[in-house]
Interface confidence: low
């Protein structure tokens, strides 16, 4: 099984650059599209860009264009993500992940924490608005309290249809436990990923989707994210924290 192993934590000054590595063990990167996703504290996951394996073609999210560079060393089975002109808002955990041709991300690296210490400097200016085409994924509720054995339903609404030009709907669900990388649960709306318990199910179409846990178990208390990979830039919901009802 492929494993993605990332480089260690980095502490950087504003204005500096950081280069994070992602090494594939158990296989080479030659056949894989590698994507980079980041997660700032308390924020949703953000897709940054990818590199194609056969020609090293890259595509970046408009938000990071000009600041991010993704490269690959084929012989070392390693992909790299370099982010320049760092500012405090870039403090985040950066993940590399492999694109599967069913449209989801799996597996994920363990994450690399990048801390940009401001040293008392002023905050940077706000980023420019997107090109108007980014799909916003709205999850509800933000927090859900249930008792073990109860049913839990999480909703995810997309700002436009997620039907891809190939006819598929690339809407996926991930579970993230504290200190861990996201883990794929459901891909393409309703397909349970390997070894995911049958109590997890996904449904929906067009713009409205639901993740259901038929009988919640103690290990299910985590944060759940929906994600769409039908349209670039790929986007994630804000997350739903499933907690034990006290």
């Amino acid at each position: 099984q492929v494993q993605l192993v990332q480089s260690g934590a980095e502490l950087k000054k504003p204005g500096a650059s950081v280069k994070v590595s992602c090494k594939a063990s158990g296989n080479t990167l030659t056949n894989y599209v590698i994507h980079w996703v980041r997660q700032a504290p308390g924020q949703r996951l953000e897709w940054m860009g990818y590199i194609l394996p056969y020609n090293d073609l890259t595509k970046y999210s408009q938000k990071f264009q000009g600041r991010v560079t993704i490269t690959r060393d084929k012989s070392a089975s390693t992909a790299y993500m370099e982010l320049s002109s760092l500012r405090s808002e870039d403090t985040a955990v950066y993940y590399c992940t492999r694109w599967d041709w069913d449209g989801f991300f799996d597996p994920w690296g363990q994450g690399t924490t990048v801390t940009v210490s401001s040293g008392g400097g002023g905050s940077g200016g706000g980023g420019s608005g997107g090109g108007g085409s980014e799909i916003v994924m709205t999850q509800s509720p933000a927090t859900l309290s249930v008792s073990p054995g109860e049913r839990a339903s999480i909703s995810c609404r997309a700002s436009q249809s997620l039907v891809h030009s190939n006819g598929n709907t690339h809407l996926h669900w991930y579970q993230q436990r504290p200190g861990q990388a996201p883990r794929l649960l459901i891909y393409s709306v309703s397909n349970r990923f390997s070894e995911v318990p049958a109590r997890f199910s996904g449904s929906g179409s067009g713009t409205d989707f639901t993740l259901t846990i038929s009988s919640v178990e103690s290990e299910d208390f985590a944060v759940y994210y929906c994600s769409q990979t039908s349209h670039i830039p790929y986007t994630f919901g804000g997350g739903t924290k499933l907690e034990i009802k006290s």
Epitope: N31, S165, G167
Partner: antibody
Framework: QVQLQQPGAELVKPGTSVKLSCKAS????????IHWVKQRPGQGLEWIGR????????KYNEKFKSKASLTVDKPSSTANMQLSSLTSEDSAVYYC?????????????WGQGTSVTVSS | DIVLTQSPASLAVSLGQRATISCQAS??????????MHWYQQKPGQPPKLLIY???NLDSGVPARFSGSGSESDFTLTIDPVEEDDAAVYYC?????????FGGGTKLEIK
């Protein structure tokens, strides 16, 4: 030169099974998926499934899920396909083919094919 | 499944002329600017041989008279000029999504 060597022919009885082999040479076996393709006499090509020799992970065409079973033997750089419960419909040429890297989701090198004849 | 419709089913072309084979997919086979459509040549008693990968890339050792074009769901294989050695059956194949599928084939005869 990359080669995928397959036995020329197999004559088998209905209801039995047959195991077809595909020996790879002149490249790193674990770096490329192996796909299998069926071609009935005078017919087109049908994708059966694929195996990742590195992990053993398989994916099948729904149509062949209960018919074909794909395995690999890493030490000998050999991919195998077992076909079970054979009927006359399974009489065909079966190709193994390599996929990955430069050609990226295209089958670049093909074996010569094994002709399977199911007859009593 | 993605259905690939090739036309014509057979084609007779004079030596030195241009041959054009069309392949239409029932849905888009393009992804992030890449078209996962490929062309193969098969001669009697031989396995298919890759000619063109990802719509327009000529495989190594394939003569430049072969070219591929198209995107989304419409693709074309062109042979210009046709040579005697080109008499064969030509297949398009998509690897956008499984099950990976092939066109029905176009038999090219040299007049």
């Amino acid at each position: 030169q990359v080669q995928l060597q397959q036995p020329g022919a197999e004559l088998v009885k209905p209801g039995t099974s047959v195991k077809l082999s595909c020996k790879a040479s002149a490249y790193t076996f674990t770096n490329y998926w192996i796909h299998w393709v069926k071609q009935r006499p005078g017919q087109g090509l049908e994708w059966i499934g694929r195996i990742d020799p590195n992990s053993g992970d398989t994916k099948y065409n729904e149509k062949f899920k209960s018919k074909a079973s794909l395995t690999v033997d890493k030490p000998s750089s050999t991919a195998n396909m077992q076909l079970s419960s054979l009927t006359s419909e399974d009489s065909a040429v079966y190709y193994c083919t390599r996929w990955g890297d430069l050609h990226y989701y295209a089958m670049d090198y093909w074996g010569q094919g094994t002709s399977v004849t199911v007859s009593s | 499944d993605i259905v690939l419709t090739q036309s014509p089913a057979s084609l007779a072309v004079s030596l030195g002329q241009r041959a054009t084979i069309s392949c239409q997919a029932s849905e888009s086979v393009s992804f992030t600017g890449t078209s996962l459509m490929h062309w193969y040549q098969q001669k009697p008693g031989q396995p298919p041989k890759l000619l063109i990968y990802r719509a327009s890339n000529l495989d190594s050792g394939v003569p430049a008279r072969f070219s591929g074009s198209g995107s989304e769901s419409d693709f074309t294989l062109t042979i210009d000029p046709v040579e005697e050695d080109d008499a064969a059956v030509y297949y398009c194949m998509q690897s956008m999504e499984d099950p990976y599928t092939f066109g029905g084939g176009t038999k090219l005869e040299i007049k």
